[in-house]
């Protein structure tokens, strides 16, 4: 059977090294040899290379070599598949090899600030050597933070034939590590050059950023202070480099800046007792080159009455992330602050807080929050320099089975009943919500039964027992992730019962 | 224009040698391989061979082999085909001619030298 | 070499004839076959590539067709203008070779 016609023919120009063909099929049903024609210097040569016959058959590529390989040229490439039965032609294929030249990478050698310009970097490389040394080379830099698996890109050409060439990449962010890589190509060329080396520059530091600021409002103390929590951190886009020297806080009641009292702290929190009035906060962060932009906060009256928007909150879970979502009854509120922290029995240890614009849902990653930890999610809503009432919520990124069952007790034995109690288990032992509990309980060599109530449910008479009879007792507490056993407890029905017995004894 | 322009006629001796010349204008021969027919009535076309004026690589036609010698210089843009111990076989007429390989053909052909070996 | 045995060596036809020359390669030459025109006292035209490809500027009337070992020329209406010599050449591998000729005469 003749073999396949050749096709799918694919040539690539290696500036200086080769060029290459290759074509599909690339495995043939029996031994196949093949023979590419080539014509060059614009159709007037032309040769022809083989794929060997024993050590390269069935090879669907072959390689022309230098000193032929001239350029600029068009080059015509026909390829015959041979075997015992006969030969089969491909179509003939053009190539300009201007369009099809792949050439070296280039070699960036720096990537610097320009000291006073802010928010660029200076990229410097040495155009590759095996490159044609008049043409027009097109470049892709791309470039991303240090700590972003996210690359962008910006093209440009390049027509100057110094070796050494650079490149200004602006509008990035102020003290930030950028790593960079570049490839290029001849400007008519489809074929890029592979990815240079990466090299890493920082932009140059600038006054801090910004801050966002938070508060959490305590109750007032027994002399009538009341103490506020104050909390701020970079603000979101601010610079990873970024480092401040302190922070300056300075606050006030409303409309009386006289009473304006100040802090220098180091600290990203600090608590201030303030009165019963409205009072305003700013703070600023600063570093050697300046201060960052004022961040506000108005506290409100202590009996001032707060607004209240969100109707309704959810909070679901998907493969890798907790979404918290609500529905809201005033449209002009679009900003929204998140407050987020483990319900332990002790102090939270870990208050984390974060703002939301122009959404009414909020995502975080399921490993920044503990597996089996309940977490209190609150979200408050902020109309300019108010903030209304909060919504919250409960969850948890991953349920277990509780770490212990509930303890039980059996009340009110009877001949035929008794009143069973149980405690609920200490939120650190529960691993997610508790959906419900069942009381397995057993007469001795007898058939276990069942009983399941609901979560709210710490109670339960059992009826319809066999008088004068031992049992078995436990109960179970359930989440979604499945159930654990409380202690294992035993109790006698009565064979008369007490009412019963003391009626007897009068008479 | 893209021409080749050859000598009219050559009469030579038997046994002796004569060397052709094939002055190309309009191309630049270094670009091309340089071919040579040679026409007899009865015979029809002959390849004799080729060379690459590029780097000076010539190939001949196994009967030609001994008997044609195909040389070029690219200062004058000129090839040359030797002839030696010439018999009255070598009587004919002989083209220079520049060949198109995408479509297979002799797209110029030179305007031909007749060769007539007579004592 | 490869040998390409062409006839018939003369051919004498009436304008309006169709003719047919057949050209046979001693081995496969797949498709690189060309066929030749060589009218008195000029060089050789390209006529036909590749077995069956119409140079630019050819009349239809001349058709090549074939593949391997076996090649046809037809004319399918003779001219008075196509009085010629036609050869056949493979440049398959080399060396090129060409047919002897058809020797095309108008009564």
């Known amino acids: 059977v003749l073999p396949a016609k050749p096709e799918n023919i694919s040539c690539i120009f290696y500036y200086e090294e080769n060029f290459t063909c290759t074509w599909s099929p690339e495995k043939e049903a029996s031994y196949t040899w093949y023979k590419v024609k080539r014509t060059y210097s614009y159709g007037y040569k032309s040769d022809i290379c083989s794929t060997d016959n024993s050590t390269r058959g069935n090879h669907a590529s072959c390689s022309f070599l230098p000193p032929t390989i001239t350029n600029p040229d068009n080059y015509t490439i026909q390829v015959e598949a041979q075997n015992a039965d006969g030969i089969m032609k491909s179509d003939i294929t053009y190539w300009n090899l201007d369009a099809i030249m792949k050439i070296e990478p280039p070699e960036i050698f720096s990537v610097k600030s320009v000291l006073g310009i802010k928010r660029m970097l200076q990229i410097k490389w040495i155009r590759p050597v095996l490159a044609p040394h008049s043409s027009t080379l097109k470049y892709t830099l791309r470039f991303r933070t240090i700590n972003s698996a996210y690359w962008m890109e910006v093209n440009f050409t390049k027509e100057d034939i110094d070796r050494d060439e650079t490149y200004n990449l602006t509008e990035l962010q102020a003290f930030t590590e950028y790593v960079m890589t570049l490839r290029c190509a001849p400007a008519e060329s489809m074929f890029w050059s592979g990815w240079s080396q990466e090299k890493v520059g920082t932009t140059e530091e600038e006054a801090p950023y910004g801050l966002d600021l938070w508060r959490v409002l305590k109750p007032a103390m027994v002399d009538g202070r009341r103490p506020v929590q104050l909390m701020w951190k970079k603000a979101t886009g601010a610079p990873v480099l970024e480092k401040a020297l302190g922070y300056n806080i300075w606050y006030f009641p409303e409309n009386n800046t006289n009473l304006t009292e100040t802090v220098n702290t180091t600290n990203q929190t600090h608590e201030l007792y303030l009165g019963g009035k409205t009072y305003w906060v700013y703070v600023v962060s600063y570093n050697s080159l300046g201060e960052s932009p004022v961040a506000t906060l108005r506290i409100p009256a202590l009996n001032e009455k707060t607004f209240q928007c969100i109707e309704a909150m959810q909070a679901c879970l998907t493969q890798d992330q907790l979404v918290v979502e609500w529905q809201s009854s005033a449209p002009e509120v679009d900003t929204w602050m998140v407050e987020w922290f483990p319900d332990v029995d002790s102090e939270p240890s870990s208050f984390s807080w974060e703002s939301v614009s122009q959404a009414r849902n909020w995502t975080i990653q399921k490993d920044e929050l503990k597996p089996l930890w309940c977490y209190n999610i609150s979200v408050y809503p902020v109309l300019r320099d108010r903030v209304g009432q909060p919504y919250s919520t409960q969850a948890y990124v991953q349920e277990g089975i509780p770490s212990a069952g509930p303890v039980t007790q059996a009340d009110s034995i009877g001949v035929k009943t008794v009143t069973i109690t149980w405690k609920e288990i200490p939120k650190s032992k529960r691993n997610g919500f508790i959906k419900n509990y069942t009381i397995f309980y057993q007469a001795e060599d007898g058939k276990e039964f069942s009983k399941t109530v609901n979560s709210n449910i710490l109670q339960y008479r059992l009826e319809s027992l066999t008088r004068r009879t031992s049992y078995s007792l436990q109960v179970m507490a359930s989440t979604n992730a499945g159930g654990t056993n409380g202690t294992k407890i035993n109790f006698k029905t009565l064979s008369i019962s007490h009412h019963h017995h003391h009626h007897h004894h009068h008479h | 224009e893209v021409q080749l322009q050859q000598s009219v006629a050559e009469l030579v001796r038997p046994g002796a040698s004569v060397k052709l010349s094939c002055t190309a204008s309009?191309?630049?021969?270094?670009?091309?391989?340089m071919h040579w027919v040679k026409e007899r009535p009865e015979q029809g076309l002959e390849w004799i061979g080729r060379?690459?004026?590029?780097?000076?690589?010539?190939k001949y036609a196994p009967k030609f082999q001994g008997k044609a010698t195909i040389t070029t210089d690219t200062s004058s843009n000129t090839a040359y085909l030797q002839l030696s111990s010439l018999t009255s076989e070598d009587t004919a007429i002989y083209y220079c001619?520049?060949?198109?390989?995408?479509?297979?053909?002799?797209?110029?052909w030179g305007t031909g030298t007749t060769v007539t070996v007579s004592s | 070499s490869i040998v390409m045995t062409q006839t018939p060596k003369f051919l004498l036809v009436s304008a309006g004839d169709r003719v047919t020359i057949t050209c046979k390669a001693s081995?496969?030459?797949?498709?690189?076959v060309t066929w030749y025109q060589q009218k008195p006292g000029q060089s050789p035209k390209l006529l036909i590539y590749?077995?069956?490809n119409r140079y630019t500027g050819v009349p239809d009337r001349f058709t090549g067709s074939g593949y391997g070992t076996d090649f046809t020329f037809t004319i399918s209406t003779v001219q008075a203008e196509d009085l010629a010599v036609y050869f056949c050449?493979?440049?398959?591998?080399?060396?090129?070779?060409f047919g002897s000729g058809t020797k095309l005469e108008i009564k």
């Open positions: 001619a520049r060949y198109y390989y995408v479509s297979s053909h002799f797209d110029v």
């Open positions: 081995q496969s030459v797949t498709n690189d």
């Open positions: 309009g191309f630049n021969i270094k670009n091309t391989y």
């Open positions: 060379i690459d004026p590029a780097n000076g690589n010539s």
């Open positions: 050449q493979q440049d398959y591998s080399s060396p090129f070779t």
């Open positions: 590749y077995a069956s």
